[in-house]
């Protein structure tokens, strides 16, 4: 029999609003095992996937998605799913991203850095919708 | 190489259950949705249905109760169930862009089915 | 379930010429959008997706624009090996699912 798979988290560091021009990443996180985890924008077409894959902790495996200089066009909704064969996931909930225009240096953001979720996540509507990852170093320019 | 390709296609009699495989070859199948379209002699393309990476299957709303579309690891398959002759066409499966679901640029040269008494 | 109503079916042009093609979605669609191009005997090869990006190989003679209801293919400078039959396709999976139907095509000859 199959095991249930948990579905996955999805944080952004430093923070979820982010000023134009820095940077910012999502971390995906599941469970030990994952062999690929996909980065999805709502109403969007794109994705990002990657198999670069780290262990986060003996119980939880973690994929990180990179954008450099955060554009206006970067701001909305984000969600993870992970490929554990078999089978895939059920979607993250929605993470959102906030850009905003940037009063200090591309080093000053608002957010405190490890924030994440808060209330910029919302449930994903996962009715229909199944179509984005991660590691450190890999770019997110299908997101774009 | 990267390609799919279309197989299980011939003359059957009305009725007759039909089942067309779509094979995967040079990628990872589970990442990719893949498509079913048809193009009856001398018609426009109509889609047909399609089997997506996480496991979702959909179906044009005339295709419902006709066709049954599965997957396995290296296959797609479309199963029609009670054909007629309305549905002797050429059978096309298809993978979306890497990055991309809006568009399907890997396509199989497609097989022919005949539906005849 | 969603229709694409593609126009104009068919449409003559001069080599080096440039030929509009349009489609509009019954429903929005945002930019999950496709257009092919098929060859008589030939399986359909992708020419834009995303409703205005260019396919791998396209030259960019070959343009996507619009979004939402409203799309438009146009093939500027026009060559012989040009014709063929376009296609417009909904890929939409979205919130809701919308089917995957295409346009009825547009017949391009050149002159």
């Known amino acids: 029999q199959e095991e249930d798979l948990p579905r996955p988290s999805i944080s952004a560091e430093p923070g979820t609003v982010i000023p134009l021009g820095s940077h910012v990443t999502f971390v995906c996180r599941g469970p030990v095992g994952v062999q690929t985890f996909r980065l999805e924008r709502d109403s969007r077409s794109t994705y990002n996937d990657t198999e670069d894959v780290s262990q986060a902790s003996p119980s939880e495996s973690e994929a990180r998605f990179r954008i450099d200089s955060v554009r206006e066009g970067n701001a909305g909704l984000y969600r993870c799913i992970y490929y554990k064969p078999p089978k895939w996931s059920e979607q993250s909930d929605y993470l959102e991203l906030l850009v905003k225009e940037s009063s200090g240096g591309p080093d000053s953001p608002d957010t405190e850095p490890g924030s994440s979720a808060g209330p910029t996540q919302r449930p994903s509507d996962n009715s229909h919708n199944e179509h984005a990852p991660a590691s450190q170093g890999l770019k997110a320019e299908h997101l774009y | 190489e990267q390609s799919v390709e279309e197989s299980g296609g011939r003359l059957v009699t009305p009725g007759t259950p039909l089942t067309l495989t779509c094979t995967a070859s040079g990628f990872s199948l589970y990442k990719y949705n893949i498509q079913w379209v048809r193009q009856a002699p001398g018609k426009g393309l109509e889609y047909i249905g399609a089997?997506?990476?996480?496991?979702y299957t959909y179906y044009a709303s005339w295709a419902i109760g006709r066709v049954t579309i599965s997957r396995t690891s290296t296959t797609v398959d479309l199963k029609m169930t009670s054909p007629t002759t309305e549905d002797t066409a050429t059978y096309f499966c298809a993978r979306h862009i890497d990055g991309d679901y809006s568009g399907y640029a890997l396509w199989g040269p497609g097989t022919l089915v005949t539906i005849s008494s | 379930e969603l229709d694409l109503t593609q126009t104009p079916a068919s449409v003559s042009a001069a080599v080096g010429g440039t030929v509009t093609i349009k489609c509009q979605a019954s429903?929005?669609?945002?930019?999950?959008f496709g257009w092919y191009q098929q060859k008589p005997g030939q399986s359909p090869k992708l020419l834009i997706y995303?409703?205005?990006k260019l396919a791998s190989g396209v030259p960019p003679r070959f343009k996507g624009s619009g979004s939402g209801t409203e799309f438009t293919l146009t093939i500027s400078d026009l060559e012989c090996a040009d014709a063929a039959t376009y296609y417009c396709?909904?890929?939409?999976?979205?919130?809701?699912?919308?089917?995957?139907?295409f346009g009825g095509g547009t017949e391009v000859e050149i002159k």
């Open positions: 429903q929005s669609i945002d930019t999950w």
């Open positions: 396709q909904n890929t939409y999976y979205g919130v809701r699912y919308l089917g995957g139907a």
């Open positions: 089997s997506t990476y996480a496991g």
């Open positions: 995303g409703a205005s």
